[in-house]
């Protein structure tokens, strides 16, 4: 017997007093257990389990499925056991089909034998087709065949446990088995939208997509900063074996203010984990933010192309949006779209397009947007620089010579004297009189400026040139003099 | 061939003591419960004792007869039983036998020729 | 100690005789009951196991029955071979205790 010491409780003994035991179908099973401290028989084979309390189990006719363990315990919790296989010709394999493998693990085919002195326990396809070449596996009669490091490509494989009873070949039942994927890789996470926008009172609603190879990836919505329990609703889909789906979507029936802020969908699995964010800002009524791409003030040249660009965010969609000079609305000339075709897109732009400019058409350029909650406009002030044109050119009753010249912007006037039949007028006069004459008029037409010189001062034959000119260009009107005598001669001005 | 040979009997004063081996060979020893079974001269058998296999943890039991003065033991590395025999008496002569149990049964399925011992002054 | 009483304990019969053997068990021994041949000067041949179960070699002649306490051993048609001593044995709970033996001899 094993040394035990006095006063040390020892395992109960088993009678017959056998590791393992065959009992014929019909027999009796008889198992007696002496132990002082007798407390109770167990049996167990696949998923059931019986227990008597009597020392002595007794089963008067054996059948197969009184195949199993059979343990003994006393009240020290110590056991001893023995194994009876019930020997049935008719029922050589004990079966529970059900068969699931963890890729990469060892798995179990649960075929046990009645009758462990039969030959050649092994797994054999269904049909005669043959095992995978790299399907390796142990067998035990007591419990079934093991399957060695189970693979993906193993998945609905169609088995039978086999041996060979007194010559023969013998198959239990078909086993179907069902591969659960190992994780080799962090869930794949995506969210509906990156950024949502809503106005107070309104339906937030976000769907996160976690894509992995089984259904027990871990996915949950979480709120930043926050250990609230979202309320999410699941719906999942098995594309194939090895490819699930599952979406979770999570909702706030009436968004207020507070819930702005960034949620979190987070999925792992024995690989790793993996997430994703969208962002909820909640306003509590729409908005309008215009922003000029070009300075509000524009000056351009006559005859030139301008371009009036504006960007802007709209929350929510603008509904109506317009170009506006002199009371007249733009009906061709602009475009407006929106900045990108994302579907969270609250910035657009709108072009107002203004070609070969006339003098007349400087001012006010009013570009006008509005949606449900506001309205916002914006100005743009156009300038068109003109050359500056000689209005008059005129001798007064009084001897002056004056010269009236418009542009934008405005232009200053010159005078120049030159003597004899000289081209080129290079000394200078200055003026007795100036004056800007519309300078309290409308702010963007032309600038009309006047100028005077006392025609008395010359004193020889030549020509004076009034030289009106501004960043654009100059025009020129000449005035010719001719003396006869003392007398001067009628002035004939020229341009 | 599948067989045990029992050695060591003999003559042997009462009070001394006496080794018994067992060899077997053509089977795998160590998977087995062992037995001795002795029969004096002109009578019946009498099972003197067994020693379970690894699976059974080598637990031992013996007849009242003999219980306290003989010794089961096993060397499964030399395919080997012992009986060792002490403070013999005369009664304990007789032709012992070293006998096999079957994996999945407790009966004698295979049984030396046996070895004489003698306990006589 | 579970006893094992044996019946008869010799007898004679002739070749081609049909002959039985009985085992009784001082308690219940379930199936837990083998049979063996011994001829003199050789050691014992087990021929019944389990009660009923025919050990492999065992010439079909040889059968057993019983259950509990009271087991037969039965030759049905004797052979010059089968002239030995035949012991029965319990093995439900050791000590493994042999019936005493029963010679079957030529008439």
């Known amino acids: 017997q094993p040394s035990v010491s006095p006063g040390e409780p020892s395992p109960p003994s088993i009678h017959p007093a056998k590791s393992e035991l065959i009992v014929r179908v019909g027999n009796e099973i008889r198992l007696l257990c002496i132990d002082p401290g007798f407390v109770k028989w167990t049996f167990e084979i696949l998923d059931e389990t019986n227990e008597n309390k009597q020392n002595e189990w007794i089963t008067e006719k054996a059948e197969a499925t009184n195949t199993g363990k059979y343990t003994c315990t006393n009240k020290h919790g110590l056991s001893s056991s023995i194994y009876v296989f019930v020997r049935d010709p008719a029922k050589l394999f004990l079966v529970d089909r059900s068969l699931y493998g963890k890729e990469d693990n060892d798995t179990l085919v649960r075929c046990p034998l009645t009758d462990p002195e039969v030959t050649s326990y092994s797994l054999k396809g269904c049909q005669g087709k043959p095992l995978p070449k790299d399907l390796r596996f142990v067998p035990d009669p007591k419990a079934g065949i093991t399957i060695k490091s189970v693979k993906r490509a193993y998945h609905r494989l169609c088995l039978h446990c086999s041996a060979d009873q007194e010559g023969k070949s013998v198959l239990s039942d078909k086993f179907i088995l069902k591969v659960r994927p190992a994780f080799k890789a962090v869930p794949v996470v995506s969210v509906s939208k990156a950024s949502y926008l809503l106005r107070e009172g309104e339906e937030f609603t976000v769907t996160c997509t976690i894509k992995d190879v089984s259904s027990s990836v871990y996915s949950t919505w979480k709120r930043e900063n926050s250990q609230t329990k979202l309320q999410e609703k699941y719906n999942s889909w098995h594309h194939g074996d090895f490819n699930y789906e599952r979406q979770a979507t999570l909702t706030i029936s009436s968004a207020r203010v507070n819930d702005s802020g960034v949620f979190m969908c987070y999925a792992n699995n024995t690989f790793g984990s993996a997430n994703v964010t969208t962002t909820l800002e909640v306003v509590d009524k729409g908005f309008i933010n215009i922003f000029p791409m070009i300075n509000t003030t524009v000056f351009v040249n006559d005859g030139e192309n301008v371009d009036l660009i504006v960007e802007y965010e709209a929350f929510p969609k603008p509904e109506h949006q317009q170009w506006i000079y002199m009371n007249r609305t733009f009906t061709d000339k602009w475009e407006d779209y929106p900045k990108s075709e994302n579907e969270s897109n609250i910035r657009y732009v709108s072009e107002l397009h203004l070609t070969r400019l006339k003098g007349t058409e400087g001012g006010t350029y009013t570009f006008l947007v509005s949606n449900s909650d506001v309205n916002a406009s914006i100005a743009f002030n156009v300038y068109v620089n003109t050359k500056p044109e000689i209005l008059t050119y005129d001798r007064l009753v009084n001897g002056m010579l004056q010269c009236v010249a418009a542009g934008f912007p405005e232009p200053t006037i010159d005078w120049y004297f030159c003597p004899g039949t000289e081209q080129r007028c290079s000394a200078s006069v200055l003026p007795v009189d100036v004056q800007t004459l519309n300078a309290s008029g409308p702010p963007f037409g032309k600038l009309v400026v006047q100028s005077s010189i006392d025609s008395s001062a010359f004193k020889h034959n030549g020509t004076v040139e009034c030289k009106a000119y501004n960043d654009v260009g100059k025009t020129s009107a000449y005035f010719n003099f001719a003396f006869k005598g003392n007398n001067k001669e009628q002035i004939h001005p020229h341009t | 061939e599948v067989q045990l040979v029992e050695s060591g009997g003999g003559l042997v004063q009462p009070g001394r003591s006496l080794r018994l081996s067992c060899t077997a060979s053509?089977?795998?020893?160590?998977?087995?419960?062992m037995n001795w079974v002795r029969q004096a001269p002109g009578k019946g058998l009498e099972w003197v004792g067994r020693?379970?296999?690894?699976?059974?943890?080598?637990?031992?039991e013996y007849a009242a007869s003999v219980k306290g003065r003989f010794t089961i033991s096993r060397d499964d590395s030399k395919n080997s039983l012992y009986l060792q025999m002490n403070s013999l008496k005369t009664e304990d002569t007789a032709v012992y036998y070293c006998a096999r149990e079957p994996k999945y049964w407790i009966d004698f399925d295979l049984w030396g020729r046996g070895t004489l011992v003698t306990v006589s002054s | 100690d579970i006893q094992m009483t044996q019946s008869p304990s010799s007898l004679s019969a002739s070749v081609g005789d049909r002959v039985t053997i009985t085992c009784r068990a001082s308690q219940s021994i379930s199936s837990y009951l083998n049979w063996y041949q011994q001829k003199p000067g050789k050691a014992p041949k087990l021929l019944i196991y389990a009660a009923s179960s025919l050990q492999s070699g065992v010439p079909s002649r040889f059968s057993g029955s019983g259950s509990g306490t009271d087991f037969t051993l039965t030759i049905s048609s004797l052979q010059p071979e089968d002239f030995a001593t035949y012991y029965c044995q319990q093995s439900y709970i050791a000590p493994y205790t042999f019936g005493g033996g029963t010679k079957v001899e030529i008439k």
């Open positions: 020693t379970r296999n690894a699976a059974g943890s080598y637990t031992t």
């Open positions: 053509g089977f795998t020893f160590s998977d087995h419960d």
